[in-house]
């Protein structure tokens, strides 16, 4: 392990499309990858009229946008599908939306997923 880096060995797995994709719906996913690549966890979700619908959660491979993020936070302003990634075992269990806006003060919207 590299000092200051949180190694990701497993992530929470969820797939809303599990029947079509022929996967489990939920579980824990071991993260594999080349030794020289960093591994992350991710979450994608939708906000349908204020109701959170998780799309996918799992492992995500070496992505500079995820480096050194201990929390899974979406910072884009009002995307159609929300995405966040992080480093550390099961760091995608909780995810949040914290848009970076220039004028107004951002507000945190933490989400504790409760898959159906």
């Amino acid at each position: 392990a590299i000092l200051g880096r949180s190694e990701t060995q497993e992530c929470l797995f969820f797939n809303a499309n599990w029947e079509k994709d022929r996967t489990n719906q939920t579980g824990v996913e071991p993260c594999y990858g080349d030794k020289d690549k960093r591994r992350h966890c991710f979450a994608t979700w939708k906000n349908i009229s204020g109701s959170i619908e998780i799309v996918k959660q799992g492992c995500w491979l070496d992505d500079i946008n995820c480096y050194d993020r201990t929390d899974c936070v979406e910072k884009k302003d009002s995307p159609e599908v929300y995405f966040c990634c992080c480093e550390g075992n099961m760091c995608n269990e909780k995810f949040s939306y914290f848009p970076e806006m220039e004028v107004t003060q951002p507000t945190s919207n933490p989400v504790t997923p409760k898959p159906p």
């Epitope: 499309n17 079509k20 994709d21 996913e29 993260c31 594999y32 080349d34 799992g58 491979l61």
Partner: antibody, heavy 120, light 107 residues
Framework: EVQLLESGGGLVQPGGSLRLSCAAS????????MNWVRQAPGKGLEWVSG????????SYADSVKGRFTISRDNSKNTLYLQMNSLRAEDTAVYYC?????????????WGQGTLVTVSS | DIQMTQSPSSLSASVGDRVTITCRAS??????LNWYQQKPGKAPKLVIY???SLASGVPSRFSGSGSGTDFTLTISSLQPEDFATYYC?????????FGGGTKVEIK
């Protein structure tokens, strides 16, 4: 060095069968999902089938569902594609390709391909 | 199935030119977008994954951008070895689908 080597292609008559193999080396085969992608002469790329690291999950393109079967033998570091009821439109170069996870499917290494020709 | 539309289907450019290829998905695919380079008679090679991440061994003149439905592959200064066909591919859901390809030719 990661290497993927396909074999088993050739000329077959419509309605016939072929089994393609992909021998993998240079990485821990049993930790990776694997895929078959094909390319008809002069055309673009078409994903055919995928299988996760332990063979628990398999998926197919609609165009081959019910005719093709993907499998793997982790003890032999080999991926297979059993192709039955072959049609002229199955004529293509077939590539095997590696992906790290079942859902984050970018294909980071590809074999050189094997040509399948379906013709009478 | 998610449809991937690439434009242009072909382009002519000179060495040193900045080249931009676009890819549009029929629905949001977040950042599940990959780019491949293929030369005649050869297997495709991964160039960009997760919309913006450079694959191992790929020169830094290649870059990717976009999220949601619209994505771009940019070659900042075209080199002789970059003349090839480029494909985008979504991995948001199965079946995996590819764009129709963009052939980059010498002007």
């Amino acid at each position: 060095e990661v290497q993927l080597l396909e074999s088993g292609g050739g000329l077959v008559q419509p309605g016939g069968s072929l089994r393609l193999s992909c021998a993998a080396s240079g990485f821990t085969f049993s930790s990776y999902s694997m895929n078959w992608v094909r390319q008809a002469p002069g055309k673009g790329l078409e994903w055919v089938s995928g299988i996760n690291y332990n063979g628990g999950y398999k998926s197919y393109a609609d165009s081959v569902k019910g005719r093709f079967t993907i499998s793997r033998d982790n003890s032999k570091n080999t991926l297979y594609l059993q192709m039955n009821s072959l049609r002229a439109e199955d004529t293509a170069v077939y590539y095997c390709a590696r992906s790290a996870t079942w859902h984050d499917t970018h294909l980071d290494y590809w074999g050189q391909g094997t040509l399948v020709t379906v013709s009478s | 199935d998610i449809q991937m539309t690439q434009s242009p289907s072909s382009l002519s450019a000179s060495v040193g030119d900045r080249v931009t290829i676009t890819c549009r998905a029929s629905q949001s695919i977040v950042r599940y977008l990959n780019w491949y380079q293929q030369k005649p008679g050869k297997a495709p090679k991964l160039v960009i994954y997760a919309a913006t991440s450079l694959a191992s061994g790929v020169p830094s003149r290649f870059s990717g951008s976009g999220s949601g439905t619209d994505f771009t592959l940019t070659i900042s200064s075209l080199q002789p070895e970059d003349f090839a066909t480029y494909y985008c591919q979504q991995s948001y859901e199965l079946p995996l689908t590819f764009g129709g390809g963009t052939k980059v030719e010498i002007k």
